[in-house]
Amino acid sequence: AILGRSETQECLFFNANWEKDRTNQTGVEPCYGDKDKRRHCFATWKNISGSIEIVKQGCWLDDINCYDRTDCVEKKDSPEVYFCCCEGNMCNEKFSYFPEMEVTQPTSNPVTPKPP
């Protein structure tokens, strides 16, 4: 372990499509991967007319986009499907949308996931 870095061993798991995919709907997912590579958690969601619909949450493989991110924050401006990743156990329990604007000051859009 590297000092000052939170290692990810488990993430919140959610699958909106659980019946079709034949998985659990929600739970805790242990994260596997090559021993020397970093592991992360992710969340994906949609914003349907202002209502937040979680699509999936779970483990994410080694990705420099997620390094040292303790919070799960989507920064892309108005994506079709929102995606964020983070490091640290269960760091994907909460997620938010904070688009990086070119000129204007960014405004935070915190997301409170609806319980399944």
């Epitope: 090559d34 590579k37 992710f42 994906t44 699509v55 999936k56 779970g58 483990c59 994410w60 493989l61 080694d62 990705d63 420099i64 986009n65 892309k76 994506p79 079709e80 499907v81 929102y82 995606f83």
Partner: antibody
């Protein structure tokens, strides 16, 4: 073990399109990216684009923008790369690779463009 | 993003060490630790050897090592063996906000 299995060789006419598939197994398909790379005969590797397998978000190399479409089907753990308006210079072996580090590769698919 | 620059070929005798360079710019190789090295034997798919500049991929012999100085990343192979004869490519991480790019490749000949 992680495996990426690609579809078979294709022979295409100039102006047509080709769609190459890449079926993943041995890991959770929706836990990373799938990248596409091509290699013309006797030439080096050329990055074409990537897809986030869970969100469907894509990025393409400028050279292929507007001509390439990368998609992913979660239900079958399969990624696809479609290249349109084919020309003879597109004759190459096309590879898919897992993740941002390209840590596992498919066996390659030879696409020959010839009239 | 423009291609990374590699020497066309390098050679060495068994047991010797060789170093392959990969030069980029201050905005890619110089700024981030995201350069990787791939080995490709004729007719085969490339194989990841080194990722994140200096991390050895699982199962890769410790004869292979990676480093970086300024805008140039390097792959060093010590104790050259006949099976090391192959093409070697440097490349960058690709995914999310990062776009991929490869070097032109270096042919390593073991004399």
């Amino acid at each position: 073990q992680v495996q990426l299995v690609q579809s078979g060789a294709e022979v295409k006419k100039p102006g047509s399109s080709v769609k190459v598939s890449c079926k993943a197994s041995g890991y959770t398909f929706t836990s990373s990216y799938i990248n596409w790379v091509r290699q013309a005969p006797g030439q080096g590797l050329e990055w074409m684009g990537t897809i986030n397998a869970v969100s469907g978000s894509t990025s393409y190399a400028q050279k292929f923008q507007g001509r390439v479409t990368i998609t992913a089907d979660e239900s079958t753990s399969t990624a696809y790369m479609e290249l349109s308006s084919l020309r003879s210079e597109d004759t190459a072996v096309y590879y898919c690779a897992r993740g941002g580090w390209f840590d596992y590769w498919g066996q390659g698919t030879l696409v020959t463009v010839s009239s | 993003q423009s291609a990374l620059t590699q020497p066309r070929s390098v050679s060495g005798s068994p047991g010797q060490s060789v170093t392959i360079s990969c030069t980029g710019t201050s905005s890619d190789v110089g700024s981030y630790n995201y350069v990787n090295w791939y080995q490709q034997h004729p007719g085969k798919a490339p194989k990841l050897m080194i990722y994140g500049v200096s991390k050895r991929e699982s199962g890769v012999p410790d004869r292979f090592s990676g480093s970086k100085s300024g805008n140039t990343a390097s792959l060093t192979i010590s104790g050259l063996q006949a099976e090391d004869e192959a093409d070697y490519y440097c490349g960058t991480f690709a995914g999310g906000k990062y776009y991929g790019v490869f070097g032109g490749g270096t042919k390593l000949t073991v004399l």
